[in-house]
Interface confidence: medium
Amino acid sequence: MAVTACQGLGFVVSLIGIAGIIAATCMDQWSTQDLYNNPVTAVFNYQGLWRSCVRESSGFTECRGYFTLLGLPAMLQAVRALMIVGIVLGAIGLLVSIFALKCIRIGSMEDSAKANMTLTSGIMFIVSGLCAIAGVSVFANMLVTNFWMSTANMYTGMGGMVQTVQTRYTFGAALFVGWVAGGLTLIGGVMMCIACRGLAPEETNYKAVSYHASGHSVAYKPGGFKASTGFGSNTKNKKIYDGGARTEDEVQSYPSKHDYV
């Protein structure tokens, strides 16, 4: 029950996270004009990954897309790539995790396959979340660097001769959405991985019982309950039912069901 809840919650959290990553990627407010000491009559500039916008003091807003690909800064391209990779991985992860959900029965899918899919989706969510966090952080770093550069220029001018007022940009709402969404996707992924660790021993115990019933002898080795949970000499036998989807190292990394009691 705890495993199902963990898996379900992991799925929901990841779903919210990926929706947030998509929203952040599409949002226009990645960088917003620093309004420090700005006049009431000023226009408000803000920029996204795909277009930049100007909101007049009247409230009228006009946005223009970046209709060039080669002319854009490499960092912006990198952020776009990271966010898209995050979305794609997250979407695939969601698709995989739907089939992996314990509460959903699809034909005669083995629990071992579900555990496998849960782990796969969990890893995808983790990578997706990391991509989003990385993308947002790269953009934020770019903003911080430019902010202080323009602040320096603002006070020094060109050799103190010309007074220039540059538009400074600060963190937009999309950055916070991206950070939170990336974090949620990451958490969801971790939860899926934890759920997977819970799925594996349960199905192993079940397989061990049916295996014994078929008349084969069980080789007990020293080491307490390990032999009966697939952590000892049974791991080789277990591979027959596993479809070879996991390495022995992966199997051995799972705790027994007793760890959840």
């Epitope: 000491n37 006049p39 009431v40 009559t41 000023a42 003091s57 009247s58 009228f60 006009e62 007022v165």
Partner: antibody, heavy 117, light 107 residues
Framework: EVQLQQSGPELVKPGASVKMSCKAS????????MHWVKQKPGQGLEWIGY????????KTSEKFKGKATLTSDKSSSTAYMEINSLTSEDSAVYYC??????????WGQGTLVTVSA | DIQMNQSPSSLSASLGDTITITCHAS??????LSWYQQKPGNFPKLLIY???NLHTGVPSRFSGSGSGTGFTLTISSLQPEDIATYYC?????????FGAGTKLELK
């Protein structure tokens, strides 16, 4: 090219009211706030207020509250200012002006209002 | 309201002179100050915005400087067509306020 075409001069009696117009062309009318400025003969410039055609919001300076009413007609891209209870103090040239950020880059040619019995 | 104190109120100069008009704001307006030129019977024309930026089509002999509360308009090498009244205007907050004006005359 941005143009602000104001209505012609007005000769009005004290106590009456006057409504002047300012037709905008060469830009999206609802995009920018329209301001109104008063200039008495031989004197300086005085900000009356603004009308925002985008959301029909208006703001007038304390001095002109209850005196000036600002409106607009989006369909004809025209801004209006009505001044009521006219006195000799209201005899002036009234300009409509288009603000770009903090600066008035475009002005109407002005409407001369003369209050005389 | 932000008061704009402009000085001098009138100024006599000869052609080719460099003249300076000052404008003082009653509170900090950063760089949100514009300068206008008005000739008799005409509407004001924008010369300088954001304290030091020259508006399109304005001759380079006009220049502006200052920030915070003190601002100056400088006309180098005065020309006959520069004879007019000059106004400063703050755009930091409503109500927008203008200086009383500086009437420039030829000596």
């Amino acid at each position: 090219e941005v143009q602000l075409q104001q209505s012609g001069p007005e000769l009005v009696k004290p106590g009456a009211s006057v409504k002047m117009s300012c037709k905008a062309s060469g830009y999206t009318f609802t995009r920018y706030i329209m301001h109104w400025v008063k200039q008495k003969p031989g004197q300086g410039l005085e900000w009356i207020g603004y009308f925002n055609p985008y959301n029909d919001d208006s703001k007038t300076s304390e001095k002109f509250k209850g005196k000036a009413t600002l409106t607009s007609d989006k369909s004809s891209s025209t801004a209006y200012m009505e001044i009521n209870s006219l006195t000799s103090e209201d005899s002036a040239v009234y300009y409509c002006a288009k603000l770009r950020q903090e600066r008035i880059a475009y002005w109407g040619q002005g409407t001369l209002v003369t209050v005389s019995a | 309201d932000i008061q704009m104190n402009q000085s001098p109120s009138s100024l006599s100069a000869s052609l080719g002179d460099t003249i300076t008009i000052t404008c003082h704001a009653s509170q900090n307006i950063d760089v949100w100050l514009s300068w206008y030129q008005q000739k008799p019977g005409n509407f004001p024309k924008l010369l300088i915005y954001k304290a030091s930026n020259l508006h399109t089509g304005v001759p380079s002999r006009f220049s502006g400087s200052g920030s915070g509360t003190g601002f100056t308009l400088t006309i180098s090498s005065l020309q006959p067509e520069d004879i007019a009244t000059y106004y400063c205007q703050q755009g930091q907050s409503y109500p927008l306020t203008f200086g009383a004006g500086t009437k420039l005359e030829l000596k």
